[in-house]
């Protein structure tokens, strides 16, 4: 049939609550293409009916919620103008207790199960959701050995755990849980994740390679809005931070009153040797101040940035 | 490094009330729940309940419902357990247990005799 | 409430014996389980934590494992200092509980 295919590495999940996955590939998936979902190498595609439990969102195959028989190999095939390329995600369901990190003791384990604080350093966790626009999520709340975590040291800022002069104690079992609203229904989801505590200064040996941008100028024009991928590829096991930066504060931080300018959610896609992340930066609408500013997107070590600048005048 | 130190033993007459101490020290004292274990002589443990330093949020077993009262002192990094209406049964060795990990670190231990 | 069922109550046993404690749980607790050494005399000393996560400076001959609701410490060659009493402790919900403890005796 003519299709490239591509093999990502498993996907180990929980029963009984929602798990969504996007087929994404930036190589193909930044221009004009179609994406179709199937299961088990089943001609059929997978169901777009919002109301079924598995169905396709734009490019994402939702769970709603994931069960004890859906394990098997999904295929996402990308068509473009001049390709085509088929993507297998191996998906393996689980049963697991509430407030249960370890996944029954299965290895492998994704690097959102595991993460790194850095002693006597001020750290984070990260909560990994990944759902389409059509899931909101609620607040998250943030559990240690199945106890509501509270103290000054710990703040909940979106998804992440902010976790103030790191010490040896904060090791340990995690799991921060959301509740998931889907066409009016609603859905626990719940990620437990282990932690490991290290004295190594920076954010481990990996120097991650940012793909795109490139120390570039966008043309933009005025007053529109305009999303920009950050792309990075770094080694599986990194501990590395990705974010984007204007003047030196997250973007964030910088536009916190007028929210004009946000840092999108990371998502990333496996591969057997790497991890290829992504974090985008979002111009609800481009105003002149932005012009001639670099907007810098920092990778651990790694940065590269873009700068906007207004079209040349049409003068025909 | 991680202790928690107890007060020292207490003889108590039946329908008294004793006053346990526990300081800590070595870690974020107002980050991580506090527990309360007994362990009456030649017996096996009892989680009596807990308490998390930072709002005094406190969780009784049902058993000691209405007679325990934990308590903390952020000043001192200092938790206290008092437990009322004491009975003979009450005779015990009480462990405070930190769970900066789930139960990682464990007082010495204090022994309350109750005898009339 | 959640019942820990642990067995043996005793055992005795020689030095370089391999000796196996069972606890079962009344109902789901995933990992959320402690294995515990208790001296007479002293504090008891968590020796496991989350079902199969070693202490720091726990010998390797201690070992924890699940299947289900039946968690096991294994210790693979029997020492002098390993004669204690031993108990498992669920975390996994309030109120916790302790199993009935499991003492390992000189043969």
């Known amino acids: 049939d003519g299709c490239k295919d591509i093999f990502m590495k498993n996907e180990i999940l929980s029963a009984s609550q929602p798990f969504a996955f996007n087929c994404t590939f930036p190589p193909i998936t930044s221009g004009e293409v179609s994406v179709t979902w199937y299961k088990n190498s089943s001609k059929i595609p997978v169901s777009k009916i919002i109301q079924s439990r598995i169905h396709q969102d734009e490019t994402w195959i939702l769970f709603l919620p994931m069960e004890w028989g859906d394990s098997g190999v999904y295929q996402c095939v990308i068509k473009g103008r001049d390709s085509c390329h088929r993507i297998h995600v191996n998906l393996t369901v689980f049963e697991k207790h509430w407030c249960d990190t370890s996944i029954g003791g299965l290895p492998n384990l994704s690097d959102e199960y595991k993460q790194i604080l850095h002693l006597g350093k001020d750290d984070s966790l990260t909560c990994h959701l990944h759902f389409p626009k059509s899931c909101v999520l609620g607040p998250i709340k943030w559990y240690k050995d199945c106890n509501e975590i509270k103290g000054e040291r710990f703040t909940v800022l979106e998804t992440r755990l902010l976790v103030s002069n790191v010490s040896a104690e904060d090791r340990g079992n995690y799991a921060c849980q959301a509740i998931l609203t889907h066409s009016g229904k609603q859905y626990e989801v719940l990620n437990g994740i282990t932690v490991s505590i290290t004295e190594r200064a920076g954010y481990g040996g990996s120097v991650p390679k940012i793909i795109y941008p490139k120390n570039h100028s966008i043309e933009v024009q005025l007053g529109t809005t305009l999303i920009v991928d950050c792309n990075v590829t770094d080694t599986k096991d990194n501990t590395n931070l990705r974010c984007w930066r204007v003047n030196n504060t997250l973007v964030d931080d910088y536009y916190d009153e007028s929210k004009r300018i946000r840092e999108g959610v990371e998502t990333h896609v496996s591969f057997r040797e790497h991890n290829l992340y992504t974090v985008n930066i979002t111009f609800l609408e481009v105003k002149m101040e932005d012009y001639g500013l670099p907007f810098m997107c920092h990778a651990g070590v790694s940065t590269a940035y873009i700068i906007l600048q207004l079209p040349a005048p049409d003068f025909r | 490094q991680v202790q928690l130190v107890q007060s020292g033993a207490e003889v108590k007459k039946p329908g008294a009330s004793v006053k346990v101490s526990c300081k800590a020290s070595g870690y974020f004292f107002t980050s991580y729940w506090m527990n309360w274990v007994r362990q009456a002589p030649g017996q096996g443990l009892e989680w009596m309940g807990m308490i998390h330093p930072y709002d005094s949020e406190t969780r009784y077993a049902q058993k000691f419902q209405g007679r325990v009262t934990m308590t903390v002192d952020k000043s001192t990094s200092t938790v206290y357990m008092e437990l009322s209406s004491l009975r003979s049964e009450d005779t015990a060795v009480y462990y405070c247990?930190?769970?900066?990990?789930?139960?990682?670190?464990w007082g010495q231990g204090t022994l309350v005799t109750v005898s009339s | 409430d959640i019942q820990m069922t642990q067995s043996p109550s005793s055992l005795s046993a020689s030095v370089g014996d391999r000796v196996t404690i069972t606890c079962r749980a009344s109902?789901?607790?995933?990992?959320?389980l402690n294995w515990l050494q208790q001296k007479p005399g002293k504090a008891p000393k968590r020796l496991i934590y989350a079902t199969s996560s070693l202490d720091p400076g726990v010998p390797s001959r201690f070992s924890g494992s699940r299947s289900g609701t039946d968690y096991t410490l294994t210790i693979s060659s029997l020492q002098p200092e390993d004669f204690a009493t031993y108990y498992c402790?669920?975390?996994?919900?309030?109120?916790?509980?302790f199993g009935q403890g499991t003492k390992v005796e000189i043969k």
């Open positions: 402790l669920q975390y996994a919900s309030s109120p916790y509980t």
């Open positions: 247990a930190s769970s900066t990990t789930a139960f990682a670190y």
């Open positions: 109902q789901d607790i995933g990992n959320a």
